[in-house]
């Protein structure tokens, strides 16, 4: 058993049929010694008396809010949560496996630049009685500070018969050094509590590996005289690190119709313009990637050919 | 050329070669398969490699003030990785595929380090740790980690030279 926060405790249980469970001793936070009784949740049934209560925690029926009273007055509470371990593996029932970029990916994180600011998100099908708490640091043995905000519900989607909820959190490294080569990864830890179930999820990454620039901005077309060709120009996204002579991007320019199966024109360039062949009913799209480190491509920015 | 006396390097040449290094480092990476390094106890095997850190003057402002500190750091790293790529970690079993870009990578690291420090001038170089994995699978894992680390190192070096070529070239 360990303390998650004041008056909230996590009991770690090996979860298998007829498991013996964990013996837990609760102590009433009071100077009183006599006439103390214990109850669980909203029940008035007295579970025991005395300053301490010893219980055998085996299942979710044994978890909940234990309250010690004296003469009708509440003295203190202890909330017990369960953390299940099945076959040596901690349960991951609360969050959905996003399976990208690999199996058992529950947290996904992205950064728009090298400023030390990043966003992480996760998915669940649970809609109520759900709380998240997020902590982060650079490195684990001698951690350097990363400040995270509160996790918020950022999107709701219908997936077949189920509703899926996306939560996200923004974090900022306290003393970021955008130009340096990272040697210690960022660690992100998410505590998830659903009713009386506790789970924790972690992710470890370098900012450089989660970079995904915003799409290029201000796409403009200029038809070339006596030619099917069009000069397309664009600018670096506002959110990208500066100066651009140092933090350079490379671009992919593509002309394609509405269907992915249609023919296309495609060219890669380090410049902020390119000449392509425009077709009726097609769109010109441009996306960006860090020029020197192969992290993710941005989403496409598009303009119609016409 | 960046010499200890403090003259400027051939920024444009360094830019071209460092960009080539980036391309080679990424084409060498798939050679050793895909695995998550952080699940493999990353710290103890690759924390000895030289990293370009915050105080090394490799940021745009630091380069404007005095590029020598940064260039010396890059030079140290290039020599370090050049020696690692020539060591038995890469030459031992399992043999690299004959078409491995590691050979080109090795030569290009040497080429860039020579551009930065011509014959006859000497910056102090960092000791190469004795990483001698006994098992072929350990060697494979170590190659992977070194190449991943090299990708990050050459990316910073390429940014430095691109910025230098754009803003510091005579």
């Amino acid at each position: 058993i360990w303390e998650l926060k004041k008056d909230v405790y996590v009991v770690e249980l090996d979860w298998y049929p007829d498991a013996p469970g964990e013996m837990v001793v609760l102590t009433c936070d009071t100077p009183e010694e006599d006439g103390i009784t214990w109850t669980l949740d909203q029940s008035s049934e007295v579970l025991g008396s005395g300053k301490t209560l010893t219980i055998q925690v085996k299942e979710f029926g044994d978890a909940g809010q234990y309250t010690c009273h004296k003469g009708g007055e509440v003295l203190s509470h202890s909330l017990l949560l369960l953390h299940k371990k099945e076959d040596g593996i901690w349960s991951t029932d609360i969050l959905k496996d996003q399976k990208e970029p690999k199996n058992k990916t529950f947290l996904r994180c992205e950064a728009k630049n090298y400023s030390g600011r990043f966003t992480c998100w996760w998915l669940t099908t649970i809609s109520t009685d759900l709380t998240f708490s997020v902590k982060s640091s650079r490195g684990s043995s001698d951690p350097q500070g990363v400040t995270c905000g509160a996790a918020t519900l950022s999107a709701e989607r219908v997936r077949g018969d189920n509703k899926e909820y996306e939560y996200s959190v923004e974090c900022q490294e306290d003393s970021a050094c955008p130009a340096a080569e990272e040697s210690l990864p960022i660690e992100v830890m998410v505590d998830a509590v659903h009713k009386l179930k506790y789970e924790n999820y972690t992710s470890s990454f370098f900012i450089r590996d989660i970079i995904k620039p915003d799409p290029p901005k201000n796409l403009q077309l200029k038809p070339l005289k006596n030619s099917r060709q069009v000069e397309v120009s664009w600018e670096y996204p506002d959110t990208w690190s500066t100066p651009h002579s140092y933090f350079s991007l490379t671009f992919c320019v593509q002309v394609q119709g509405k269907s992915k199966r249609e023919k296309k024109d495609r060219v890669f360039t380090d410049k902020t313009s390119a000449t392509v062949i425009c077709r009726k009913n097609a769109s010109i799209s441009v996306r960006a990637q860090d020029r020197y480190y192969s992290s993710s491509w941005s989403e496409w920015a598009s303009v119609p050919c016409s | 050329r960046a010499v200890p006396g403090g003259s400027s390097p051939a920024w444009t040449q360094c830019q071209q070669l460092s960009q080539k290094l980036c391309t080679l480092a990424w084409s060498a990476h798939p050679l050793v398969g895909h695995m998550d390094l952080r699940e493999e106890g990353d710290e103890e095997t690759t924390n000895d490699v030289p990293h370009i850190q915050c105080g090394d003057g490799c940021d745009p402002q630091g380069l404007r003030d005095n590029s020598q500190f940064c260039l010396q750091r890059i030079h140290q790293g290039l020599i370090f990785y050049e020696k690692l790529l020539g060591s038995d970690i890469f030459t031992g079993e399992p043999s690299l595929l004959p078409d491995s870009p590691v050979g080109q990578l090795h030569a290009s690291l040497l080429g860039l380090s020579q551009l930065l420090q011509p014959e006859g001038h000497h910056w102090e170089t960092q000791q190469i740790p004795s990483l001698s994995p006994s098992q072929p699978w350990q060697r494979l894992l170590l190659r992977f980690k070194i190449l991943r680390s090299l990708q990050a190192f050459v990316a910073v070096a390429a940014r430095v030279f691109a910025h230098g070529a754009a803003t510091l070239s005579p």
Partner: antibody, heavy 118, light 107 residues
């Protein structure tokens, strides 16, 4: 299977015009760009131009502008290359090539030898 | 027009050898570079697209690398069927242009 089958060899006199064909099969003709590339005996490859069979748009290499005409007939899934004012240096193997991507060549015809000789 | 220069123009090698062919562009072309193989009397065949992307059905012994102005095609462990002429082609801008070719001959 995506295939391009070209018409047979031609022998022409200088100043004449020749029209060679390239019949596509195994795919929807208008879904691919069609290019023409030539190769003089013992020499390298030279790109001449392309056509989008869907709308008839064409683009030619400056060297061949006015010299060649590329057309396409979607009713027969056939592309054509017409070369005018033939000279001995136009003696070459002419290849048609196709791809869904405009700028490189995924599928090639077997080639048509055009010999210009008096 | 962008000029493409291949070297060497010919190379003699034995089965099992590793052969590297280089291609240099007269200006930066990012990764807009493709490689073809041509055997005598046959049409060219696409081997690599966009400098390093493999083509389905092409043996993995063919690999490409490079960006900007310098590119290479490597044939690992040359097979008897690999004796042919190899061409690079830039697609950075029109007109599309090819290198002069590199003939890989039996030693």
């Amino acid at each position: 299977e995506v295939q391009l089958v070209q018409s047979g060899a031609e022998v022409k006199k200088p100043g004449a015009t020749v029209k060679i064909s390239c019949k596509a099969s195994g795919y929807t003709f208008s879904d691919y760009y069609l290019h023409w590339v030539r190769q003089a005996p013992g020499k390298g490859l030279e790109w001449m131009g392309w056509i989008d069979p869907e709308n008839g748009d064409t683009e030619y290499a400056p060297k061949f502008q006015g010299k060649v005409t590329i057309t396409a007939d979607t009713s027969t899934d056939t592309g054509y290359l017409e070369l005018s004012s033939l000279r001995s240096e136009d003696t070459a193997v002419y290849y048609c090539a196709a791809n869904k991507e405009l700028r490189y060549f995924d599928v090639w015809g077997q080639g048509t030898l055009v010999t210009v000789s008096s | 027009d962008i000029q493409m220069t291949q070297s060497p123009s010919s190379v003699s090698a034995s089965v099992g050898d590793r052969v590297t062919i280089t291609c240099r562009a007269s200006q930066s072309i990012s990764i807009n570079l493709h490689w073809y193989q041509q055997k005598p009397g046959k049409a060219p065949k696409l081997l690599i697209k966009f400098a390093s992307q493999s083509i389905s059905g092409v043996p993995s012994r063919f690999s490409g690398s490079g960006s900007g102005t310098d590119f290479s095609l490597t044939i690992n462990s040359l097979q008897p069927e690999d004796f042919a002429t190899y061409y690079c082609q830039q697609s950075n801008s029109f007109p599309l242009t090819f290198g002069g070719g590199t003939k890989v001959e039996i030693k």
